[in-house]
């Protein structure tokens, strides 16, 4: 069975999280996609979503979040710019497919944002160049208000045991090591 892994990204305030979620393009290319945060014991909360139908490689900006759906490649790119400590948390990409439940994508992202930065020029942690020039054509998409009750309603287990999600062959495996991303700005 495919493993739904949780990857940990450790970044400094002011840096940019720059990740991607892949999907089956034949199935979901033009479907609306969303970026959600999963708070302990709560329903996932949608922070941003693409337009409906999703436009190819057309950036959508909602606050500090930029979504770009390359549906000719089957990839949703998610950027969270100018990170703040309070952005720390567990995130996931989903595909809206009403009336069915949202379809969860690979992987979940455990984001840890810490204060300060090691500002040596050229270092991986350099946060002085984190300025994204967003095309002026970006739009704010309206996201569906509903969140499926069967999408994760509690924090994932702290053990490394595999836990099957409902109606799927996907397993959740916690990944304990940290990704210190190279110059995500």
């Amino acid at each position: 069975a495919t493993k739904l892994t949780e990857e940990k990204y450790e970044l400094k305030e002011g840096q940019t999280l720059d990740v991607k979620c892949d999907y089956t393009l034949e199935k979901f290319a033009s479907s609306q996609k969303a970026w959600q945060i999963i708070r302990d014991g709560e329903m996932p909360k949608t922070l941003a979503c693409t337009e409906r139908p999703s436009k190819n490689s057309h950036p959508v900006q909602v606050g500090r979040i930029i979504l770009e759906d390359y549906h000719d490649h089957g990839l949703l790119r998610v950027r969270m710019v100018n990170l703040q400590v309070e952005d720390s948390g567990l995130y996931q990409c989903v595909i809206y497919q009403p009336p069915k439940e949202p379809h969860m994508l690979f992987d979940r992202i455990r984001l840890v944002v810490t204060k300060g930065f090691s500002g040596t020029p050229g270092s991986n942690e350099n946060s002085t160049q984190n300025v994204y020039k967003i095309p002026p054509t970006t739009t704010k998409a309206l996201c569906p208000l509903y969140t499926s009750p069967r999408t994760v309603t509690q924090a994932p287990p702290k053990s490394t045991a595999d836990v099957s999600t409902p109606d799927s062959e996907i397993n959740l495996t916690n990944v304990t090591d940290i990704i210190r991303v190279p110059v995500f700005n």
């Epitope: 720059d18 990740v19 490689s57 089957g74 950027r79 990704i179 190279p182 110059v183």
Partner: antibody, heavy 122, light 107 residues
Framework: QVQLVQSGAEVTKPGASVKVSCKAS????????INWVRQATGQGLEWMGW????????GSVQKFRGRVTMTRDTSITTVYMELSSLRSDDTAVYYC???????????????WGQGTMVTVSS | DIQMTQSPSSLSASVGDRVTITCQAS??????LNWYQQKPGKAPKLLIY???TLETGVPSRFSGSGSGTDFTFTISSLQPEDIATYYC?????????FGGGTKVEIK
Amino acid sequence: QVQLVQSGAEVTKPGASVKVSCKASGYTFTRYDINWVRQATGQGLEWMGWMNPNSGNSGSVQKFRGRVTMTRDTSITTVYMELSSLRSDDTAVYYCARGGISSSWHWAFDIWGQGTMVTVSS
Amino acid sequence: DIQMTQSPSSLSASVGDRVTITCQASQDINNHLNWYQQKPGKAPKLLIYGAYTLETGVPSRFSGSGSGTDFTFTISSLQPEDIATYYCQQYDKLPLTFGGGTKVEIK
């Protein structure tokens, strides 16, 4: 050590298909994307597409769409790239290359296979 | 697609010389640029990622700089083993694209 080992050279006719394999070892196979890059003799590098060995999802550049199929066998940590309807201008060395962590927008290819020469000739 | 223009396409320098290669993107790519070295008959090798971060194990005579559309790759003191073709590659937008390459030879 971390390495990618590709299948041997192929000679094939126009219109046929070729399937190149890329065997990964020395790292967690399902955690990193595998990309395919080709290089015609004396020419530059051309990215063809990517595959996530965990999800099995893949994507390719527009010019190869409909002709390229990427698959994987996680039990033997191998990714395959099949190119169909071959033409003489598909003659090239085909490389597999490891990308970043599958969830990361970090497309740097840090490990490369040795390359597979594919010759398309009638 | 983003076009990557490398210059010069080839150069000849003496051992110990400082060698500079430039790569220009057709649009702003932030610092999403990698540099590779390819020796004849071999697969490319990653030297620099994120415009200026040296890959582990790569000699410090190699360096990269730049942001936006203009990037520079430098070999501070050319060595005989540096004879190769060097490529830049952008990853700011898909599809990923490479520069045309710069062939470096020894005088």
